[in-house]
């Protein structure tokens, strides 16, 4: 170990490279400086991401994976550091960068939005469920009329190219649908989406974006909603949505609309049943929606409301249909 009165000069790492290893994914690699003395001390490295978004962290190993957008270019630096309780010793920085890809910014797509959804798998021999992906975008304002766009997604180590596009009136792809993907419903990794393009007239700049699954996952509505009235008690029940998340992972909202006086009651619940006291003169429509609770993942989107169920008195219909 280093003695208190021993002087040490830290040298920057060498052979610092940035390698694109996948869609929106780079590998930073470097080597310890061969001229570095005191090899036996616990040297660490400080990595600084300069662009597209500033970040910095420390590591003991000589490589680092980074998930990042790349359409604006990418720049990073690394230096050797030695820390103890009292001080930080650091070398100068070694830097490297990836330039922004060719094509003027106006040729790339804008307003990329994506949503995921869980559906029953029609192909599976077992009763299993798939995660679908739907993305839409707008054509770049400076994109030539003959521009064609192509979408890819990466989740974990799977990358797939879109096979089902929707087109605008000029035949340009403006939306993509993956009925089945390798995206994990409960996954915590970023979903990376890339849209690149081609034209005979000019280079089309690619556009990539990272999505957090909880923010784009369109939860299914609750299943088998039932409502019945006994006197002045309106009893509502439902089942959890089709989802990878178990029964305890859902918050619900129940909407009870009194169609006679327009009064709207909305209740937030963590159970799958609700009883409301009502008047027995009115007709009601009842709807329920669901969201994954913050106990199970970060807050996300509410589902659509379930189809309305009508209960109660209706002067146009008998109370019971025999």
């Amino acid at each position: 170990d280093l003695l208190p009165d021993e002087k040490i000069s830290l040298l920057p790492p060498v052979n610092f490279t940035i390698k694109v290893t996948g869609l929106a994914q780079v590998l930073l690699q470097w080597k310890p400086n061969p001229d570095q003395e005191q090899r036996n001390v616990n040297l660490e490295y400080q990595v600084k991401i300069n662009a597209p978004k500033e970040d910095d962290y420390e590591t003991r190993i000589t490589e680092s994976k980074c998930v990042t957008i790349l359409h604006k270019g990418f720049s990073a630096s690394v230096r050797t550091i030695l820390q103890n309780d009292h001080s930080l010793l650091a070398s100068s920085w070694a830097s490297a960068e990836l330039h922004a890809p060719p094509g003027s910014p106006g040729t790339s797509i804008v307003n990329l939005t994506c949503t995921t959804n869980t559906t029953e798998d029609n192909y599976s021999r077992l009763r299993s469920y798939q995660v679908s992906l739907h993305c839409t975008w707008l054509v770049g304002t400076d994109a030539p009329e003959d521009t064609q766009y192509f979408l890819y997604y990466r989740y974990g180590s799977w990358t797939e190219e879109c096979q089902e596009y929707s087109k605008d009136t000029l035949g340009r792809n403006i939306a993509c649908w993956f009925p089945r993907t390798f995206i994990l419903s409960k996954g915590r990794d970023w979903l990376a989406v890339l849209v690149n393009g081609s034209s005979k007239h000019s280079a089309i700049r690619p556009f990539d974006q990272l999505f957090a699954l909880h923010a784009i996952d369109q939860i299914n509505p609750p299943l088998n909603v039932t409502a019945e009235i006994e006197g002045t008690r309106l009893s509502i029940q439902w089942e959890k949505p089709v989802s990878a998340f178990p029964i305890h992972c859902f918050d619900y909202e129940v909407k009870i609309h009194n169609t006679r006086n327009g009064y709207l009651q909305i209740e937030k619940l963590m159970t799958n049943a609700f009883i409301s006291i009502i008047d027995d003169l009115s007709k009601y429509d009842v709807q329920v929606r669901a969201a994954v609770s913050s106990m199970c993942r970060e807050a996300g989107l509410w589902s659509e409301w379930s189809q309305p169920i009508y209960v109660g008195n209706d002067e146009h219909k008998p109370l019971r249909e025999w």
């Epitope: 869980t118 192909y123 021999r125 077992l126 180590s157 190219e161 994990l184 409960k186 915590r188 990878a244």
Partner: antibody, heavy 121, light 112 residues
Framework: QVTLKESGGGLVQPGGSLRLSCAAS????????MSWVRQAPGKGLEWVSA????????NYADSVKGRFTISRDNAKNTLYLQMNSLRAEDTAVYYC??????????????WGQGTTVTVSS | QAGLTQPPSVSAAPGQRVTISCSGS?????????VHWYQQVPGTAPKLLIF???NRPSGVPDRFSGSKSGTSASLAITGLQAEDEADYYC????????????FGGGTKLTVL
């Protein structure tokens, strides 16, 4: 009745190559991702590689990355594994299996009977 | 250390109940990812026994059941029969692995 039948195994020297095939029948092959899983003698199961239904996206275990290539011919209902730079530790029974997912988590619903690859000098 | 840990062997008499554990980590079972179980009778290919933690494919007797809690999963077999003697493997998704598929090391079940 889903049937997967592997072939192409055999004895090969270290550094050599081998190509495994898996003939599929009884289901719409082009709708399914497919996979190879191996089992060394007296050892457990090890996932090797997978390919998506269209054949354009592939995935490999670190132990075979850069040496093995998975591919498929949907017109022939056949899955392939090209194995290059073979090592003694690649000796195993190689199984072809469908790569199904439930909420994204993979599982292997149907398996072939396996083909034996022995790497030895 | 990525991977799922199973006991190398378990044994029980016919008619008894036996459980096989599968211990993981935060990058696999602990993240809530489903666990699947396979049975491999000596000399044959593996067969899917339980998928999605506790669902049985058709043809698998209800003597087999799966459960999961925290970073571990279990396979339970009740009313043990001689033909249950086999190797059993758990499998899940692991976000830290290339390719993401992770198997347990396998458990040899001996019916006494």
């Amino acid at each position: 009745q889903v049937t997967l039948k592997e072939s192409g195994g055999g004895l090969v020297q270290p550094g050599g190559s081998l190509r495994l095939s898996c003939a599929a029948s009884g289901f719409t092959f082009s709708n399914y991702a497919m996979s190879w899983v191996r089992q060394a003698p007296g050892k457990g199961l090890e996932w090797v590689s997978a390919i998506n239904s269209g054949g354009k996206s592939t995935n490999y275990a670190d132990s075979v990355k850069g040496r093995f290539t998975i591919s498929r011919d949907n017109a022939k209902n056949t899955l392939y594994l090209q194995m290059n730079s073979l090592r003694a530790e690649d000796t195993a029974v190689y199984y072809c299996a469908d790569y199904a997912t439930n909420y994204g988590v993979p599982y292997f619903g149907s398996w072939g009977q396996g083909t034996t690859v022995t790497v030895s000098s | 250390q990525a991977g799922l840990t199973q006991p190398p062997s378990v044994s029980a008499a016919p008619g008894q109940r036996v459980t096989i554990s599968c211990s993981g980590s935060r990058s696999n079972i602990g993240s809530g990812y489903d666990v699947h179980w396979y049975q491999q009778v000596p000399g044959t290919a593996p067969k899917l026994l339980i998928f999605d933690d506790n669902n049985r494919p058709s043809g698998v007797p209800d003597r087999f059941s799966g459960s999961k809690s925290g970073t571990s999963a279990s396979l339970a077999i009740t009313g043990l029969q001689a033909e249950d003697e086999a190797d059993y493997y758990c499998q899940s998704y692991d976000s830290s692995l290339s390719g993401h598929v992770v198997f347990g090391g396998g458990t040899k079940l001996t019916v006494l």
